[in-house]
Amino acid sequence: LTCLGGFASPGPVPPSTALRELIEELVNITQNQKAPLCNGSMVWSINLTAGMYCAALESLINVSGCSAIEKTQRMLSGFCPHKVSAGQFSSLHVRDTKIEVAQFVKDLLLHLKKLFREGQFN
């Protein structure tokens, strides 16, 4: 990142507030799901590792016209310190693997709950 002319730095591990709010929103989406989420749109699967918030946003931002995940997209942008736009491809995506948005949200939710339990808020 230093080649960009500035530098990105991780902050201290923040309180659990932000992560809890994101988890609550994902729970809300999964529980209120009536028809297929986002009309069954497919998104790139991601590696749930370091940098996953940016990767998740890069994946979900390619879904347009789906109000159910707009708040999630906005919340993820508050975790990711760089500018994300539709059409980007992250090295954290699992190449050639696409899954439905509903499955993506479930996978992300399970992982975030695990992080929350372990106290890894960053």
């Epitope: 902050g11 923040p14 906005r74 942008s77 508050g78 059409g87 960053n122």
Partner: antibody, heavy 120, light 112 residues
């Protein structure tokens, strides 16, 4: 309505440090970046850096890397800038501004600014 | 760092006139994601800056349609079709594509 309320003006001695605050209200604090901008008297604007409140990660202007440290307290919806080893060059108005994902990260709301005067 | 050069430094106008401010970047300001993060802000005397235009040509909510932004690559322009008294102040262009993000030096719009 969206508001960014900044702490009061400060008079500090050379070599001292100061911590300025920016309290957000009227929106979900952790969903929007907070940028910090410096404006010296009668001068233009300089971008110091921004912080993603959800993760606490920052992007900083290298010119300020030994001068400014950006942090947030998500429990009180407050962003902070800690300025250290102050000199007359640091006398300026410091603004916080929200970076909005909805408007392609543009700074859509600004605080009123905090004036810092460095003088012995 | 990307240098943003605004011209003119000062722009005296009569109310009702058209005004045009130019902003030139020292290098292309297309972000690696393909977007051009070029914004325009107005700072009225004694106030905080306010967002007018984002992503080159998009007007922010509540900004009158007499304001328009255009340009690409390294050359950008802000036009005000009919200047009103509330438009007076200093206009800044800003690039948010390459870190460190940078502002232009400002253009002061004043009454002739």
């Amino acid at each position: 309505q969206v508001q960014l309320q900044q702490s009061g003006d400060d008079l500090v001695k050379p070599g001292a440090s100061v911590k300025l605050s920016c309290k957000a209200s009227g929106y979900t604090f952790t969903s929007y970046w907070i940028n910090w901008i410096k404006q010296r008297p009668g001068q233009g604007l300089e971008w110091i850096g921004h912080i993603a409140p959800g993760s606490g990660e920052t992007y900083d202007n290298e010119m300020f890397k030994d001068k400014a440290k950006l942090t947030v307290d998500t429990s009180s919806n407050t962003a902070y800038i800690h300025l250290s080893s102050l000199s007359s060059e640091d006398s300026a108005v410091y603004f916080c501004a929200r970076g909005s994902f909805t408007f392609f990260y543009a700074m859509d709301y600004w605080g009123q600014g905090t004036s810092v005067t460095v003088s012995s | 760092d990307v240098l943003m050069t605004q011209t003119p430094l000062s722009l005296p106008v009569s109310l009702g006139d058209q005004a045009s401010i130019s902003c030139r970047s020292s290098q292309n300001i297309v972000h690696s994601n393909g977007k051009t993060y070029l914004e325009w802000y107005l700072q009225r005397p004694g106030q905080s800056p306010k967002l007018l235009i984002y992503k080159v040509s998009n007007r922010f909510s509540g900004v009158p349609d007499r304001f328009s932004g255009s340009g690409s690559g390294t050359d950008f322009t802000l036009k005000i079709s009919r200047v009103e008294a509330e438009d007076l102040g200093v206009y800044y262009c800003f690039q948010g594509s390459h870190v460190p993000y940078t502002f232009g030096g400002g253009t002061k719009l004043e009454i002739k």
